[in-house]
């Protein structure tokens, strides 16, 4: 057993540009408090998963009111350490979440409102009994400076608080089979301490905190006798019946404690030790209120202070769930139409629209030809969010403003010469070729492939392409 201790040194704007706005104002004075959540191992569990090693809430800090025009300074902090007691061995590796909460002290009729200002998280290795470890963590524009340590509660010692020490009974040496307790050489390792309440007559342990039963006894504390009943011998019906051991039902069998409560037997019945936020004989009553800081990701808690009061979390954009614990992938709903690109900025959703579309969700199809005249008698053609001009003969370019050179593409085949003409182009064919583009040989196999040239046009004369 032992205690994890956290000392907050400062909470304020981090270095660099973009200093955060003060969380408090003259209209809404506020004060800070902190919540720490510890989990064993180097887990990357979600923020809302249970704080299996324990959690603690600080006292409220002094009331703070922003000075108009002044940048947010380091904010006044609550006094004292945050202490998280642990019952079992210290795991050596742990994950932490430290949340900075703001309590608004305006004239809310329903009591103060709480909101999460910043959350930092990390994974660390730490031996119990070591010196304070210092840390700096950043959350957005905020910076949190803190120290932490784990220390064992006597009589436990060691890096995991599993070895137990007792003052020496004799001045010179420890009892049989027990070693001196480094670094406390004047103390001796004590015999193992079994689970609290473990029957001294019917239970024993090989590890601290366990309770193993001698034959004939059962239950978590080895206090329940295994019932002896008559039962048939497997040798057959003619044999005499022999006594056999059948485990008797213990009051904690099947764990009657709800919501993660732990059951311990009492002489008459059982008792549930409930986790924070639950109470009642079987931990069946939820007593979570806004004071427990149940809303994650900057959610604002609404509710009264009475344990019977309900609470709801008013979630910021991009989060949902009863505690704002789930991030919403709002782009998965494909809100941007007409092929727009979706951007989830956290505080808002943006659509980057393709050319020719506009609107918050790219829902407006722009009239591509509106206000886009095509020059020189060209006509505008809409298509796929862009416009193009179909140009009159002799003109080209995006808006038909360029006078086209019809000969630029070398349209005349077989060495024909191209002449620009007011109505298009004319090809003067090389000897032996004819056609609008000089594409036909005059005598393909010695005979003309075409009818005789029309009157007034000899083969080889320029052919006008109409």
């Amino acid at each position: 057993a032992g205690v994890f201790e956290l000392q907050i040194h400062s909470f304020g704007p981090g270095p660099g540009p973009g200093a955060p706005r003060s969380p408090c104002s003259a209209r809404l004075p506020c004060r800070l408090f902190f919540r720490v959540c510890l989990k064993p191992g180097l887990s990357e569990e979600a923020a809302e998963s249970p704080c299996a090693l324990g959690a603690a809430l600080s006292a409220r800090g002094p009331v703070y009111t922003e000075q108009p025009g002044a940048p947010a300074p380091d904010l006044p902090l609550p006094d004292g350490l945050l202490q998280v007691p642990f019952r079992d061995a210290w795991p050596g590796t742990f994950s932490f979440i430290i949340e900075t909460w703001r309590e608004e002290l305006g004239d809310q009729i329903g009591g103060p409102a709480w909101s999460l200002l910043a959350r930092v998280a990390g994974r660390r290795r730490l031996a119990a009994g070591g010196p304070w470890a210092r840390d700096i963590q950043r959350a957005g524009a905020w910076e949190l400076r803190f120290s932490y340590r784990a220390r064992c509660e006597p009589p436990a010692v060691g890096t995991a608080c599993t070895r137990l020490c007792r003052p020496r009974s004799a001045p010179s040496r420890c009892g049989p089979g027990l070693r001196p307790c480094a670094p406390l050489e004047d103390e001796c390792e004590a015999p193992l301490v079994c689970r609290a309440g473990c029957s001294p007559e019917h239970g024993f342990c090989e590890q601290p905190g366990e309770c193993r039963c001698l034959e004939g006894w059962t239950g978590p504390l080895c206090t329940v006798p295994v019932s002896t009943s008559s039962c048939l011998s497997p040798r057959g019906p003619s044999s005499a019946t022999t006594g056999c051991l059948v485990p008797g039902p213990g009051p904690c069998d099947g764990n009657p404690c709800a919501n993660g409560g732990s059951c311990s037997e009492t002489p008459r019945s059982f008792e549930c030790t409930c986790p924070r936020g639950f109470y009642g004989l079987r931990c069946e009553v939820s007593g979570v209120t806004c004071a427990d800081g149940p809303c994650f990701n900057g959610g604002l808690c609404v509710g009264g202070a009475d344990p019977d009061s309900a609470y709801i979390c008013h979630c910021p954009p991009g989060f949902q769930g009863s505690n704002c614990e789930k991030r919403v992938d709002r782009c998965s709903l494909q809100p941007c139409r007409n092929g727009g690109l979706c951007l989830d900025l956290g505080h808002a959703l943006r659509c980057r629209c393709r050319a020719g579309f506009a609107g918050p969700r790219c829902e407006h199809d722009l009239d591509d030809c509106a206000g886009r005249a095509c020059a020189n008698g060209g006509t505008c053609v809409e298509g796929g969010g862009a416009h193009r001009c179909s140009c009159a003969l002799g003109f080209g370019g995006r808006d038909c403003r360029e006078r086209a050179d019809p000969c630029a593409a070398r349209p005349c085949a077989h060495g024909g010469r191209c002449y620009a003409h007011f109505s298009g182009l004319v090809c003067a064919c090389a000897p032996g070729y004819m056609g609008a583009r000089c594409e036909f040989p005059v005598h393909p196999d010695g005979a003309s492939a075409l009818p005789a040239a029309p009157p007034g046009l000899r083969p080889g004369d320029p052919q006008r392409y109409l």
Partner: nanobody, 115 residues
Amino acid sequence: EVQLVESGGGEVQPGGSLRLSCGPSEIITSDKSVGWYRQAPGKQRNLVAGISNVGSTNYAQSVKGRFTISRDNAKNTLYLQMSSLRAEDTAVYYCYARDFENEYWGQGTLVTVKP
């Protein structure tokens, strides 16, 4: 200033039912968290039932299974259906709405449960 207006309170016998309404009001929109608080004489004001802006509902332990909160966004109205009423439900019931910037309250409606 825009106010929320409750209706539907009154006197009822134990085991009876009442339906409280709040609105219509342009305050009661889907982007707001809304709820019903109650305050008995000499007691704190506590949230009986609420619906968050993301649609999660929650109830005080003492009313679970007996009260139902609902909202009609088309009519901008909030409701609280109360059944199996008990003497300890006697209180002034307040309609409430909030966003990140502001919170809004009704003036309250009295619910009295007595034989």
